[in-house]
Amino acid sequence: IFPLAFFIYVPMNEQIVIGRLDEDIILPSSFERGSEVVIHWKYQDSYKVHSYYKGSDHLESQDPRYANRTSLFYNEIQNGNASLFFRRVSLLDEGIYTCYVGTAIQVITNKVVLKVGVFLTPVMKYEKRNTNSFLICSVLSVYPRPIITWKMDNTPISENNMEETGSLDSFSINSPLNITGSNSSYECTIENSLLKQTWTGRWTMKDGLHKMQSEHVSLSCQPVNDYFSPNQDFKVTWSRMKSGTFSVLAYYLSSSQNTIINESRFSWNKELINQSDFSMNLMDLNLSDSGEYLCNISSDEYTLLTIHTVHVEPSQETASHN
């Protein structure tokens, strides 16, 4: 009946509703049907959220913060539904809401505790800082404070830094890990316990490839089955690192099945893509193609980074000319 939020029953006629920042939620309240229905929703027993009586809304003394954000299920009131539809919740809306419902028979009060969570999709980034390589797991906006865990080759890492900045309504969090000189695979998990939402970032370094000039190279990129769900929207990006910054070679959007290619020598195999294999070919290599190639498969629930190091060496021909 209430699809926009989930709620947990707790004692003393109190329910907990968990909402998501900027989304709509329903604060549930029901009563034994009767005539002469009066409904008042209040916040923290002080601020007027919504009033209904004598057959219509009376919002003259509604607190301004709720203006144009609340409504009742008017066709359902006579059936005992006093639930409040609440638009675009913010973190400032967290707290206890009391619903007073009066009928010709009785007056009852229901309490609803609203908790609001934020979880903007995190990202896993690979950065070079001078001679050091870093993996950074970051989330731009999250609330409450998340749990971040790192694993190296599936073994938890105990020390991990967390750089945190708090804004008015949420946290912004960076968790960097120095992986200089490591060939291990790394995994970062960010969990929002309130929203029961987990995101995982996984980084894998492939063995270095040595190629001759004018040859072509095939670089593999296949999602790990544990994370990958083909019916979930995702994006695949291939990029190349040059002088510390990545330039995008190509990307693929699963929602539209669009492939955008920025490098004419880059090719993707459509059949492989249909089998969720995003390996790519780069033709006619030249010396400047040496570097790191990154495949990024990202959805709302995961980021899978696969990195290849390619060394392009001069062909015998070229060498003899020099």
Partner: antibody, heavy 120, light 107 residues
Framework: QVQLVESGGGVVQPGRSLRLSCAAS????????MHWVRQAPGKGLEWVAV????????NYADSVKGRFTISRDNSKNTLDLQMNSLRAEDTAVYFC?????????????WGQGTLVTVSS | DIQMTQSPSTLSASVGDRVTITCRAS??????LAWYQQKPGKAPKLLIY???SLESGVPSRFSGSGSGTEFTLTISSLQPDDFASYYC?????????FGGGTKVEIK
């Protein structure tokens, strides 16, 4: 059972003040709107004021606006009417009455009334 | 404010009579009307609310009807206990108002 008992009535000179109280019992006081209604000797009923269940909304009859103040203490289950600048025409039996619920504005339970006489 | 005009102001009737009291509002009040009975020296007693809903414990010989501006209270068969004053009251607006009252006395 629901009980409403008014007190504080008496004889007072014009221009003076008086405070009426109503002690409520037998129901959850904080859930209901409360009213004062008066009746001049040999006359009809006149509504005076209402206060919402939570004390946030108050409304008054034009005849008493600016002179009378309705208030409530939900922790003590009491309703008060502070009457200032009293006039001869305020002479009446003052009834405290309980609303149907929080804001319906009609009266299910009544006290027996307390007489206020404004006379010099 | 909304004015409530009640008629008649006095009504003489006998036990067993069918009695009708009318109440007219100066503007539409939908069905937000209550009727009360009051006996001398006593507090009023609610009979009817929302124009036609009978309050719990009130005998079924009392009935209310009407909407908008015209309302009636009917006592189908007057009983000795029914000789009293009757008041209508509108609660459509923030300032509620009563009618002037109708005294039902023994003929």
């Amino acid at each position: 059972q629901v009980q409403l008992v008014e007190s504080g009535g008496g004889v007072v000179q014009p221009g003076r003040s008086l405070r009426l109280s109503c002690a409520a019992s037998g129901f959850t006081f904080s859930n209901y709107g409360m009213h004062w209604v008066r009746q001049a000797p040999g006359k009809g009923l006149e509504w005076v004021a209402v206060i919402w269940y939570d004390g946030t909304n108050k409304n008054y009859a034009d005849s008493v606006k600016g002179r009378f103040t309705i208030s409530r203490d939900n922790s003590k289950n009491t309703l008060d009417l502070q009457m200032n600048s009293l006039r001869a025409e305020d002479t009446a039996v003052y009834f405290c009455a309980r609303d149907r619920n929080t804001a319906m504005d009609y009266f299910v339970y009544w006290g027996q009334g307390t007489l206020v006489t404004v006379s010099s | 404010d909304i004015q409530m005009t009640q008629s008649p102001s006095t009504l003489s009737a006998s036990v067993g009579d069918r009695v009708t009291i009318t109440c007219r509002a100066s503007q539409s009040i939908s069905s937000w009307l209550a009727w009360y009975q009051q006996k001398p020296g006593k507090a009023p007693k609610l009979l009817i609310y929302k124009a036609s809903s009978l309050e719990s414990g009130v005998p079924s010989r009392f009935s209310g009807s009407g909407s908008g501006t015209e309302f009636t209270l009917t006592i189908s068969s007057l009983q000795p206990d029914d000789f009293a004053s009757y008041y209508c009251q509108q609660y459509n607006s923030y300032s509620v108002t009563f009618g002037g009252g109708t005294k039902v006395e023994i003929k």
